[in-house]
Interface confidence: low
């Protein structure tokens, strides 16, 4: 597994790692994905000026990226473990189509993009094992996802670059919020 940033100090621990608890494993998995997103964002920002662009709103109209809201119960005020966990899983399931879109958007980081996608699938599985109320989790409609993917891929080059940047930024923010919330569970 990749080495999460700032983890070097843990490397000099006892010679045999103990099996990770469910929470540690989820925490570690999210940090792996965030590490991968950082690498992808680096390539995106080096390739275009999207990261400094003020025209994000133009592209954002085409996207319906998951975001944390007060009602989701993931913030410190009004924290609700069950509601929040449902939101995190639902959000990750919704992000999957956008991660699929990212698969052909990278040259030097193509493998990293696939790793982020696969790691997210595993994270969803971890969280589903943790969730008690799986019935409350809505799975995105495959037909809707397929047409969204087609629509995103049909955009002009500028919009595709902007979409890539926005997906990575939003996914990073969503995961960071999830990480904070999961540490309270």
């Amino acid at each position: 597994a990749p080495v999460p940033p700032g983890e070097d100090s843990k490397d000099v621990a006892a010679p045999h790692r103990q099996p990770l608890t469910s929470s540690e494993r989820i925490d570690k998995q999210i940090r792996y994905i965030l590490d991968g997103i950082s690498a992808l964002r680096k390539e995106t920002c080096n390739k275009s000026n999207m990261c400094e662009s003020s025209k994000e709103a133009l592209a954002e109209n085409n996207l319906n990226l998951p975001k944390m809201a007060e009602k989701d119960g993931c913030f410190q005020s009004g924290f609700n473990e069950e509601t929040c966990l449902v939101k995190i899983i639902t959000g990750l399931l919704e992000f999957e189509v956008y991660l699929e879109y990212l698969q052909n958007r990278f040259e030097s980081s193509e493998e990293q993009a696939r790793a982020v996608q696969m790691s997210t699938k595993v994270l969803i599985q971890f969280l589903q094992k943790k969730a008690k109320n799986l019935d409350a989790i809505t799975t995105p409609d495959p037909t809707t996802n397929a047409s969204l993917l087609t629509k995103l891929q049909a955009q002009n080059q500028w919009l595709q670059d902007m979409t890539t940047h926005l997906i990575l930024r939003s996914f990073k923010e969503f995961l960071q919020s999830s990480l904070r919330a999961l540490r309270q569970m």
């Epitope: 080495v3 792996y32 493998e111 790691s119």
Partner: antibody, heavy 119, light 106 residues
Framework: QVQLQQSGAELAKPGASVKMSCKAS????????MHWIKQRPGQGLEWIGY????????EFNQKFNDKATLTADRSSSTAYMQLNSLTSEDSAVYYC????????????WGQGTTLTVSS | IVMTQTPKFLLVSAGDRVTITCKAS??????VAWYQQKPGQSPKLLIY???NRYSGVPDRFTGSGNGTDFTFTISTVQAEDLAVYFC?????????FGGGTKLEIK
Amino acid sequence: QVQLQQSGAELAKPGASVKMSCKASGYTFTTYWMHWIKQRPGQGLEWIGYINPSTGYSEFNQKFNDKATLTADRSSSTAYMQLNSLTSEDSAVYYCARDAYYGNYEDYWGQGTTLTVSS
Amino acid sequence: IVMTQTPKFLLVSAGDRVTITCKASQSVSYDVAWYQQKPGQSPKLLIYYESNRYSGVPDRFTGSGNGTDFTFTISTVQAEDLAVYFCQQVYTSPYTFGGGTKLEIK
């Protein structure tokens, strides 16, 4: 694409030491742990240990604690395994394998280095 | 942790369904992988985290399990599936492999 190129076959005498290499390409060497696995002819696979190339920290199957030393050279993206005090039991194919992004599974393997220990 | 893999040998015809099992000496959660090693080649990862197919692996290969008992299935064996199959636990170090199952095609 990801490739792990291992050094050629080795013939060594009992009691000697040998150092084999595994050159990584197609990915960021320091991001992924590198595992080493032993396979004796017609037998199963035995996990020896891994090294974190980013820090040099390694962890072993206790059985190989005094047998193997793992190192990594970040400048050449190469991992090394040294085996000492060789006996005929060490005759085997040794694989380096990159740790997968999503757990401690090995997703890319080198072609293997055959070690023959004989007097 | 000891991974006991059965059977050791399988002689099947193309088109058959094949099941290999691996029993862990203690719970390994779902931290199990399955590898395929064709003659003269290095092992290849097929299944990880108990049931996830690795990228590019045909969907005739599936994995399942319950913590200590794990099953690997090839729904319709093809001639190119001639290989040795290994399970591996990565729940805790030292990571251990099953003894392998040699699949031969009639």
